[in-house]
Structure formats: structure tokens, C-alpha cells
């Protein structure tokens, strides 16, 4: 028989973790697993338990994680990778809306994330969404155009900046920007 099905790996409460704040990584396989292996990729680091409690987030713990489990002599497929990001490593960027934060339905608006530092990567988050705002192909960028705005675009946005050299060490979040669709 083939490999066992992959487990799930999640970060609670979030995979975006402010420095010095706690986070729990949880690997979930089927009942009765003999052994779990949680590993930090591109490093030599691991643990043989399903749950990793990080009492205070540090730069050294940011990175990509995955887990697998063993039943008898069989190992499972690895979980999907989890990207654990340390935030608050750098000063917050500023987030603005052009031409402004109030936009008519059907209109266009561009959210711009700016930083004083030479960061080449940016991520935009909308409160309540599980993942960053993405444009096709390129989603880390200083400008995020929203074409043909709808009511679904209204809400609270924040952006982060970081460097591609250290992709898991992010700035503090920008001050929130409230986008109002009229």
C-alpha cells in the first residue's frame, strides 16, 4: 500500500505572530498515530510531537514548517507547508488609498503601501480574510489596484513590508485603513 494520507498543520491563533507573542503549531493526523515529526524546513530543527507551543515568538522560529506522522513502519505524506511569520521586526509602513478611502461602487481605487526602508516586498491584508489580498501572479507589491470596486471590497485593510532576503521577518502592520464603498 502507498503512503499514509497527509496530516494538516495549522498555527493558532494565526501564522502571523508579533514578536514576543505566543503561538501554537498543531499537526493533526488520524486517531492512533504512533509518532509525529514536525520540522522547520531549511534548517536542522524538528520535534517528535504533534503540538509545538511557542511561548514567545522569536526571529529564529520564523520560517516554513511541515509535519508528517508514522504508523508502524509507514510514514505519511508531508503536510502542506505552513509559513510562520514574525511581525513587528521592523517599523510599520503607511497605507493610503488613491484617490481616497471613499469610493463609489464600480469605481477604481489603489491601495498604496509605503515604507521608509528599502523593502522590496509588501503584503496587504483585509480584516476577516484568511489570506493576503492577491493580484494574479504578483501580489507582494507597493501598489494594490482594485478595479471595479464592489461592496465586498469595503472593510479594514492593513499592509506589511519585508525583504525577500528574509521573507518570514515582517514589519509591524500599518495603521488600519477603512475602505468605504458608497
Amino acid at each position: 500500500s502507498g503512503p499514509l494520507p497527509k496530516p494538516s498543520l495549522q498555527a493558532l491563533p494565526s501564522s502571523l505572530v508579533p514578536l514576543e507573542k505566543p503561538v501554537t503549531l498543531r499537526c493533526q493526523g488520524p486517531p492512533g498515530v504512533d509518532l509525529y515529526r514536525l520540522e522547520k524546513l531549511s534548517s536542522s530543527r524538528y520535534q517528535d510531537q504533534a503540538v509545538l507551543f511557542i511561548p514567545a515568538m522569536k526571529r529564529s522560529l520564523a520560517g516554513r514548517y511541515r509535519c508528517s506522522y508514522q504508523n508502524g513502519s509507514l510514514w505519511s505524506l508531508p503536510s502542506d507547508q505552513l509559513e510562520l511569520v514574525a511581525t513587528g521586526v521592523f517599523a510599520k509602513p503607511s497605507l493610503s488609498a488613491q484617490p481616497g478611502p471613499a469610493v463609489s461602487s464600480g469605481g477604481d481605487v489603489t491601495l498604496q503601501c509605503q515604507t521608509r526602508y528599502g523593502f522590496d516586498q509588501f503584503a496587504l491584508y483585509k480584516e476577516g480574510d484568511p489570506a493576503p489580498y492577491k493580484n494574479p501572479e504578483r501580489w507582494y507589491r507597493a501598489s494594490f489596484p482594485i478595479i471595479t470596486v464592489t461592496a465586498a471590497h469595503s472593510g479594514t485593510y492593513r499592509c506589511y513590508s519585508f525583504s525577500s532576503r528574509d521573507p518570514y521577518l515582517w514589519s509591524a502592520p500599518s495603521d488600519p485603513l477603512e475602505l468605504v464603498v458608497t
Epitope: 505566543p22 522547520k40 534548517s43 536542522s44 530543527r45 524538528y46 520535534q47 517528535d48 509545538l52 507551543f53 511557542i54 511561548p55 514567545a56 522569536k58 529564529s60 522560529l61
Partner: nanobody, 127 residues
Framework: QVQLQESGGGLVQAGGSLRLSCAAS????????MGWFRQAPGKEREFVAA????????YYADSVKGRFTISRGNAKNTVYLQMNSLKPEDTAVYYC????????????????????WGQGTQVTVSS
């Protein structure tokens, strides 16, 4: 919040002894290894000694072997460094560090990563 608090530093004459303590406080603290490092003025921080919680294996820098002993307390959150036959070149700020995750490297390897660090305690050895 995790805190590593060193104590036991001070001024001692060459040939004397000191015992450093490191206590880890904070929420449910677990660790693969705890280690001691030191930094002398104008020099880089260097590894001194480490102990793995699982099995209690110990590791030492060549410069302190036979003189320093690392041990753990009854509680899993305390580690000690007994320093005997101290020399003036042992003068430095001594830091306690701990690693949350296991590693394929031993704790004295340059690629071994420590996550939590104390503020340090000064050890001065006079001649």
C-alpha cells in the same frame, strides 16, 4: 512571555570559583537544550557549555573543559554553571540561552540555533 534570568556573577580572584544560575520563567516552558555563552569586551560572543534536557548530555568549549561543569536543577527550568580554577581570560558577560526545538546538530555546533536569551551576568576574574 519567556524570561531567562542569570545570577551568581561577580568579582573573584584567579583560581577561585563561582556558580552561575539560570532560571527560566514564563508560560509552560520546554526546551531541547540550554547553554551558556560569554562575551568579553571587544570580542564576539562565544559558546561555553550546554546541556540537553533529554538524556542530560553535556558539551563544553575546549577552553573550559575540566574547569567548568554544567548541570540542571530538579525543576526543569533551571541550569547551573559551576566555574572552578577561574582565569583572568574568563572575564566576560555570561549569557544563558535555550532552544525550543531539537536539532540534528549538537548544542555546541555553530549552526545550532538558540531562541531565548537572558540579559547576562558579569563575571570578573582579577589576577
Amino acid at each position: 512571555q519567556v524570561q531567562l534570568q542569570e545570577s551568581g556573577g561577580g568579582l573573584v580572584q584567579a583560581g577561585g570559583s563561582l556558580r552561575l544560575s539560570c532560571a527560566a520563567s514564563g508560560r509552560t516552558f520546554s526546551s531541547d537544550a540550554m547553554g551558556w555563552f560569554r562575551q568579553a569586551p571587544g570580542k564576539e560572543r562565544e559558546f561555553v557549555a550546554a546541556i540537553r534536557w533529554s538524556g542530560g548530555s553535556t558539551y563544553y568549549a575546549d577552553s573550559v573543559k575540566g574547569r567548568f561543569t554544567i548541570s540542571r536543577g530538579n525543576a526543569k527550568n533551571t541550569v547551573y554553571l559551576q566555574m572552578n580554577s577561574l582565569k583572568p581570560e574568563d572575564t566576560a558577560v555570561y549569557y544563558c540561552a535555550s532552544s525550543l526545538l531539537n536539532s540534528y546538530y549538537p548544542p555546541d555546533h555553530t549552526s545550532y540555533e538558540y531562541d531565548y536569551w537572558g540579559q547576562g551576568t558579569q563575571v570578573t576574574v582579577s589576577s
